[in-house]
């Protein structure tokens, strides 16, 4: 759920207070500790392989 006063994000994205915009939940695979990932429906399905 969005914080009051923030624009709703489309499906597959979540609001980033740090960046002040909607961010892709898909990016949580590479950066799972991003604060907006808490707003994504599911945990990233696989670790980012280096």
């Amino acid at each position: 759920e969005q914080a009051p006063g923030t624009a709703p994000c489309s499906r597959g994205s979540s609001w980033s207070a740090d960046l002040d915009k909607c961010m892709d939940c898909a990016s949580c695979r590479a950066r799972p500790h991003s604060e907006f990932c808490l707003g994504c429906a599911a945990a990233p399905p696989a670790p980012f392989r280096l």
Epitope: G12, M23, A26, R29, A30, R31, P45, L50
Partner: antibody, heavy 119, light 111 residues
């Protein structure tokens, strides 16, 4: 408006050195992974280096073709990223772009700067 | 490294017709939720311009004429109807692992 302004490049002899710079504006620089991508007729678009975030002690990654010769660095206080290139080879000739990505795709690119390695 | 193979290398399409560009990965670049393939457009003398992320999501400002699809190893960029301004080289890129690699590009020309 996001802008990545590049400087550096030019003609250098084989074995020589060159430093490229890129100054960013219009986005929260310190949150983004910064990259260098080069382009040549022979190799096409080739990712060559990435530097990540201060929170992780600025980890870096390099393409095998430049490992040990190129060094990427950044200065978040100046919104800048750099590429120090040593022991340059003719095959390093190309257009060099700085590009940013949060995690996956390169959403903004610099205008490009040309490096020619030739005697 | 994950190799991306684009086809065709070049494509000539009439105004208003459909252009279809393929990108095949040497291994799967998809999870159950997302595909880690992205598309770019490059015009002469310019840097690549980001078009589509995660196989099918257009960047803001990219016309709906551009669409992406696919999962696993096979991905497609469609442009329909093609306009004159679409003359360019199109590249796919993966972000499955380090190094992120690009396809060799597909040159789109108008008849």
């Amino acid at each position: 408006e996001v802008k990545l302004q590049q400087s550096g490049g030019g003609l250098v002899q084989p074995g020589g050195s060159m430093k490229l710079s890129c100054v960013a504006s219009g986005f929260t620089f310190s949150y983004y992974w910064m990259n260098w991508v080069r382009q040549s007729p022979e190799q096409g678009l080739e990712w060559i280096a990435e530097i990540r975030l201060q929170s992780n002690d600025y980890p870096t990654h390099y393409a095998e073709s430049v490992k040990g010769r190129f060094t990427i660095s950044r200065d978040d206080s100046k919104n800048s990223v750099y590429l120090q290139m040593n022991n340059l080879r003719p095959e390093d000739t190309g257009i060099y772009y700085c590009a940013c990505r949060y995690a996956d795709y390169f959403d903004h690119w610099g205008q490009g700067t040309t490096l020619t390695v030739s005697s | 490294d994950t190799v991306l193979t684009q086809s065709p290398a070049s494509l000539v399409v009439s105004l208003g017709q459909r252009a279809t560009i393929s990108c095949r990965a040497s291994q799967s670049v998809s999870t159950s939720d997302y595909s880690y393939i992205h598309w770019y457009q490059q015009k002469p003398g310019q840097p690549p311009k980001f078009l589509i992320k995660y196989a099918s999501n257009r960047d803001s400002g990219v016309p709906a004429r551009f669409s992406g699809s696919g999962s696993g190893t096979d991905f497609t960029l469609n442009i329909h109807p093609v306009e004159e301004d679409d003359t360019a080289i199109y590249y796919c890129q993966h972000s499955w692992e380090i190094p992120p690699t690009f396809g060799a590009g597909t040159k789109l020309e108008l008849q």
